[in-house]
């Protein structure tokens, strides 16, 4: 058993039918010595006297806010939490897997560029009784500052029959350099907690290996006279790093005809402009890329041809 | 990157097409080493990630683009200095160029350089035969290097006359891929920079 | 103390059906995640599918993906694994299992997929 | 399908020291915890071990696991005629929840 917050502790089990559980010593937080009673949540029923409390700890059912009183007056509360260990795995019930960019990805993040400021996101079902805390770090056995905000509600769908829930939470490396190499990683841990269980998420990941640059602004096409050719020019977006000759993008410029069978067309160019052939109906698109450090690409800045 | 790569202006900072093939090259061999040495653990997620220039030479300060020099999470161990003497800055003035930045690279690829054939040298004995190093890697170095045209002592291979252990060889080369890749990087957007002053 | 009571098995053509169950007791059936294996004859033993205590998520092993379906009912304390277009290579003892460190079999059913 | 590789048969006299080994690679042994079965003639496979070295209580301590790096493996310190059967070793695939592998099981003759 152990503390994640004040008055909230956290008990371990080993998760099989017929386990023998957890045995459970609680105190009462309290100068008093006599007349301590003992009841679990809502219920009257009276679980024990004295300034302590043993409980086997085998089931969701154990689980629960314990309080203890004397006289109708409540002296302490403790919340009991399950946290389930199935055969060596920690159980991960409450987040769904996002599969990407591999099997067991539960947290997903994200960068626009160097300055040590990035974007987490995971996803779940569960609508309600739901609480999530994030904590971050630069490496784990001597760790420096990243400081996160709270775990918002960013986004509803509906998949199927059900409903899905994407929470996200903005960190900050507290001293970053942007030019600096990384040598340990970012260690982001999110607490979870559904009803009475307890469940911790866990990714580590490089900066550089999570960037995902916005996409080119100010997207423009310049007909070139006498000619179906066009001059497609774009800027840098304003949340890449500066300066721009250090931190370099390449990008991609493609040709799409109105319909996603056709044939598209596509430039690679480290300039910040191309000619290329713009067809009736079609659409230009530009994205943008790491010159030098092959992470993501970003979303598509687009403009039809017309 | 397999993507259309144009070939730099004749009239360009000298250095910039070989420090772009020279991460190109690394790319390319730590790809190889990744597929070669599958059920080693060879990536990112696995490996330790040692820096053998850690204490030895300062690029990443030393080559500092100035609008970074106001973020003070980058002034840890800042020395500037603003005399140039190598032949890639024969054409260029401009008061970035330091001869700390580039000496500091030389540096780097000559240590990298006598690391990995010291490597090369353990994995030609191996019966597995399973893994070498890219002679065109090696020889972009070298071609950097000669770009730089830095005078400084030359460094002895390493000799060992103890039998490798070829499964550590292997695990050591990977480590020193990954992060001779992210100084490849930095090198890169250095020459970048210095071609755009 | 729990138990685990299939029931299901048989002969059975190529290409036809058959509903395995796996009758809990014993413990809270809707707690804990559930696993098929099977065990062809005189072979070793072979993983089939896993569903989680809610039936929120099932995983297949590729031998049997498309074909089998793992389901539960916590109101009836029942395991099931729905079994379509049947090969020969199917026919075996399968095994439905509790998931955790302490795992508690069932007696096993047979499975023969002949013509 | 068998993922785990053990040695096909191993034996021994009674009183001997027996074991099984089981490789795998870093997607399973490697980085999850590995258990045994006993299997006796004609019924359901039975937990000698789990979380590599842990043993059930009504196991005798005669049977032992470790798991290095990976591959794992069983001991019958003072084999018995009733060990006579055959055993499979166990572990999970870290690409996939639930996903269980198995041993491709190793039969246990006492001479």
């Known amino acids: 058993i152990w503390e994640l917050k004040k008055d909230v502790y956290v008990v371990e089990l080993d998760w099989y039918p017929d386990a023998p559980g957890e045995m459970v010593v609680l105190t009462c937080d309290t100068p008093e010595e006599d007349g301590i009673t003992w009841t679990l949540d809502q219920s009257s029923e009276v679980l024990g006297s004295g300034k302590t409390l043993t409980i086997q700890v085998k089931e969701f059912g154990d689980a629960g806010q314990y309080t203890c009183h004397k006289g109708g007056e409540v002296l302490s509360h403790s919340l009991l939490l399950l946290h389930k260990k199935e055969d060596g795995i920690w159980s991960t019930d409450i987040l769904k897997d996002q599969k990407e960019p591999k099997n067991k990805t539960f947290l997903r993040c994200e960068a626009k560029n160097y300055s040590g400021r990035f974007t987490c996101w995971w996803l779940t079902t569960i609508s309600t009784d739901l609480t999530f805390s994030v904590k971050s770090s630069r490496g784990s056995s001597d760790p420096q500052g990243v400081t996160c905000g709270a775990a918002t509600l960013s986004a509803e769908r509906v998949r199927g029959d059900n409903k899905e829930y994407e929470y996200s939470v903005e960190c900050q490396e507290d001293s970053a350099c942007p030019a600096a190499e990384e040598s340990l990683p970012i260690e982001v841990m999110v607490d979870a907690v559904h009803k009475l269980k307890y469940e911790n998420y866990t990714s580590s990941f490089f900066i550089r290996d999570i960037i995902k640059p916005d996409p080119p602004k100010n997207l423009q096409l310049k007909p070139l006279k006498n000619s179906r050719q066009v001059e497609v020019s774009w800027e840098y977006p304003d949340t890449w790093s500066t300066p721009h000759s250090y931190f370099s993008l390449t990008f991609c410029v493609q040709v799409q005809g109105k319909s996603k069978r056709e044939k598209k067309d596509r430039v690679f160019t480290d300039k910040t402009s191309a000619t290329v052939i713009c067809r009736k109906n079609a659409s230009i698109s530009v994205r943008a890329q790491d010159r030098y450090y092959s992470s993501s690409w970003s979303e598509w800045a687009s403009v039809p041809c017309s | 990157r397999n993507l259309p790569v144009a070939t730099p202006d004749p009239g360009m900072f000298p250095c910039l097409h070989h420090s772009q093939n020279l991460l190109r090259a690394v790319s390319n061999m730590l790809q190889k080493a990744r597929q070669t040495l599958e059920f080693y653990p060879c990536t990112s997620e696995e490996i330790d990630h040692e820096d053998i220039t850690k204490d030895k030479t300062s690029t990443v300060e030393a080559c500092l683009p100035l609008e970074l020099t106001k973020n003070e999470s980058c002034l840890n161990s800042r020395e500037t200095s603003f005399i140039t003497n190598g032949s890639c800055l024969a054409s260029r003035k401009t008061s970035f160029m330091m001869a700390l930045c580039l000496s500091s690279i030389y540096e780097d690829l000559k240590m990298y350089q006598v690391e990995f054939k010291t490597m090369n040298a353990k994995l030609l004995m191996d019966p597995k035969r399973q893994i070498f190093l890219d002679q065109n890697m090696l020889a972009v170095i070298d071609e950097l290097m000669q770009a730089l045209n830095f005078n400084s002592e030359t460094v002895p291979q390493k000799s060992s006359l103890e039998e490798p252990d070829f499964y550590k060889t292997k695990i050591k080369l990977c480590i020193l891929l990954h992060a001779f890749r992210i100084r490849a990087v930095t090198i890169d957007r250095v020459m970048s920079y210095l071609n755009a002053s | 103390q729990v138990q685990l009571v299939q029931s299901g098995g048989g002969v059975v053509q190529p290409g036809r059906s058959l509903r395995l169950s796996c009758a809990a007791s014993?413990?809270?059936?809707?707690?804990?995640?559930m696993h098929w294996v099977r065990q062809a004859p005189g072979k070793g033993l072979e993983w089939v599918a896993f569903?989680?205590?809610?039936?929120?998520?099932?995983y297949y092993a590729d031998s049997v993906k498309g074909r089998f379906t793992i389901s539960r009912d916590n109101s009836k304390n029942t395991l099931y694994l729905q079994m379509k277009s049947l090969r020969a290579e199917d026919t075996a003892v399968y095994y439905c299992?509790?998931?955790?460190?302490?795992?508690?079999w069932g007696q096993g059913t047979m499975v023969t997929v002949s013509s | 399908s068998y993922v785990l590789t053990q040695p096909p048969s191993v034996s021994g006299t009674p009183g001997q020291r027996v074991t099984i080994s089981c490789s795998g690679g870093?997607?399973?042994?490697?980085?999850?915890?590995v258990k045994w079965y006993q299997q006796l003639p004609g019924t359901a496979p039975k937990l000698l071990i789990y979380?590599?070295?842990q043993r059930p209580s009504g196991v005798p301590d005669r049977f032992s696991g470790s798991k290095s790096g990976t591959s794992a493996s069983l001991a019958i310190t003072g084999v018995q005629a009733e060990d006579e059967a055959d055993y499979y070793c166990?572990?999970?695939?870290?690409?996939?929840?639930?996903?269980?592998?198995f041993g491709t099981g190793t039969k246990v003759t006492v001479l």
């Open positions: 569903i989680r205590y809610d039936g929120s998520n099932k």
């Open positions: 979380g590599n070295d």
């Open positions: 014993g413990f809270t059936f809707s707690s804990y995640g």
């Open positions: 870093r997607s399973n042994i490697g980085s999850n915890t």
């Open positions: 299992t509790t998931h955790g460190s302490h795992d508690n």
């Open positions: 166990q572990s999970y695939d870290s690409s996939l929840r639930g996903s269980r592998v």
